[in-house]
């Protein structure tokens, strides 16, 4: 039979507002049928939109009856529409796109890690951290020293001395484990996780007992 | 982005004080130690000591002991050297820079310099 | 007091590679892993070019690369340009003073 165009996915179009972090990919859908098969064009704010109108261009998928955009970016926010067409009709969808700047933060550190470990003498321990950071981050494992029989300097802040950080062939998975093997009494002692990006700081601490 | 911006050039006669001012933005403050660094004309660079913006704490280098105060103001995000006492081969470029320590922890083995103001020109002469 | 030790100057042609030594002790640049370098242009303040021995920070050009062996380090640039031409400090942690540098090397780009 012929006809003029129609959704055949309805129930997936119901979300009209989207709203993105920055740099995310976005693709919006129009599901239509009709005979002759119908058209797909898009406009941005009421006008034809084309690749050549936003950096990083588009991907039209007319199989899909969709629009890709990728990297999103604040100047991508505006109303999209889908016109579907064939010589008995058009129907049409519009669609709101949001781009919200990620604030950037400090890294997160998962809750738990690293965890208080005992070990016996001579055996390998393992502590683990995991880091979430939008921007790069740079991962250190401390351990805490005395110096000159104090545990704080003249300030009151902790020694520490760095144990670990990233090598220029060290993985971020790498860095997010301690290794230490052949424990022994001088290792016990509080060992801290520190990860810092272009924001700030975090860290988590935990103690590691040697048992006889 | 993180930025240090330092006050402007200065002229001092032999014996008296200057106090160079870093103010930062771009980052948290008080998470990084404040070091300063001098260079002297057509000479290499000399490290001066830190300050830690969060505890106040400082470390100077043996040789300017006793002559140099590093001091901040946490509510401006602005740090300060003072160097007293001034002889003619004090001449040089004053840098701050901020040093990858993280401020809640004194090190006792590590540290590199990420971000430099754009230094201050300080003359000694009489 | 200059506590590493740099060759005053180098020079190599564009597009060469040329390599700029550091030597220090066992109490600074042989006991850690923790020497960085810095590119200063005339007039211009430093800026980071390495760090942790062989880490780029991001922005800075994969032809610049970091080493150490024992009490050495270097560092080493490849297919030189003529704006690689600058002033270049090494430095590292020592256990006695903190923070050393090298006395600076002059790299020239012949051309």
């Known amino acids: 039979d012929t006809g003029a165009p129609y959704w055949t996915r309805p129930e997936r179009m119901d979300k009209k507002l989207l709203a993105v972090p920055a740099a995310n990919t976005v693709r919006f859908r129009c599901p239509a049928a009709g005979n002759p098969t119908p058209s797909i064009s898009w406009l941005k704010n009421g006008r034809e939109f084309r690749g050549e109108h936003r950096i990083g261009g588009i991907k039209l998928r007319h199989q899909q009856w969709s629009l890709v955009m990728e990297s999103v970016v604040p100047s991508d926010r505006g109303n999209y529409t889908c016109v579907v067409e064939n010589k008995f009709g058009s129907i049409r969808q519009t669609y709101t796109l949001d781009v919200l700047e990620r604030s950037p933060h400090r890294p997160i550190l998962q809750a738990g890690l690293p965890a208080n470990q005992t070990a016996v003498l001579g055996s390998d321990v393992e502590f683990h951290c995991k880091v979430y950071s939008d921007a790069q981050p740079h991962i250190q494992w401390l351990k805490h020293v005395e110096v000159n029989g104090s545990k704080v300097g003249p300030d009151g802040t902790p020694y520490v001395t760095v144990l670990k950080t990233a090598g220029a062939n060290t993985t971020d998975k790498e860095l997010e484990v301690l290794s230490l093997h052949n424990v022994t009494f001088e290792d016990a002692g509080e060992y801290t996780c520190l990860a810092g990006n272009s924001i700030g700081f975090s860290h988590h601490s935990a103690w590691l007992v040697v048992l006889p | 982005q993180v930025q240090l911006v330092q006050s402007g050039a200065e002229v001092k006669k032999p014996g008296a004080s200057v106090k160079v001012s870093c103010k930062a933005s771009?980052?948290?403050?008080?998470?990084?130690?404040m070091h300063w660094v001098r260079q002297a004309p057509g000479q290499g660079l000399e490290w001066m000591g830190w300050i830690n913006p969060n505890s106040g704490g400082t470390n100077y280098a043996q040789k300017f002991q006793g002559r140099v105060t590093m001091t901040r103001d946490t509510s401006i995000s602005t740090a300060y050297m003072e160097l007293s006492s001034l002889r003619s081969e004090d001449t040089a470029v004053y840098y701050c820079?901020?040093?990858?320590?993280?401020?809640?922890?004194?090190?006792?083995?590590?540290?590199?310099?990420?971000?430099w103001g754009q230094g201050t020109l300080v003359t000694v002469s009489s | 007091d200059i506590a590493l030790t740099q060759p005053a100057s180098v020079s190599g042609s564009p597009g060469q590679s040329i390599t700029i030594s550091c030597t220090g002790t066992?109490?600074?640049?042989?006991?850690?892993?923790?020497v960085s370098w810095y590119q200063q242009h005339p007039g211009k303040a430093p800026k980071l070019m390495i760090y942790d021995v062989s880490n780029r920070p991001s922005g800075v050009s994969n032809r610049f690369s970091g080493s150490k062996s024992g009490n050495t380090a270097s560092l080493t640039i490849s297919g030189l340009q003529a704006e690689d031409e600058a002033d270049y400090y090494c430095q590292s942690y020592d256990n006695n003073s903190d923070v050393v540098f090298g006395g600076g090397t002059k790299l020239t780009v012949l051309g």
């Open positions: 066992s109490s600074d640049v042989g006991g850690y892993n923790y």
């Open positions: 820079a901020r040093g990858y320590w993280y401020a809640y922890f004194t090190y006792i083995n590590y540290g590199y310099f990420d971000n």
């Open positions: 771009g980052y948290t403050f008080t998470s990084y130690y």
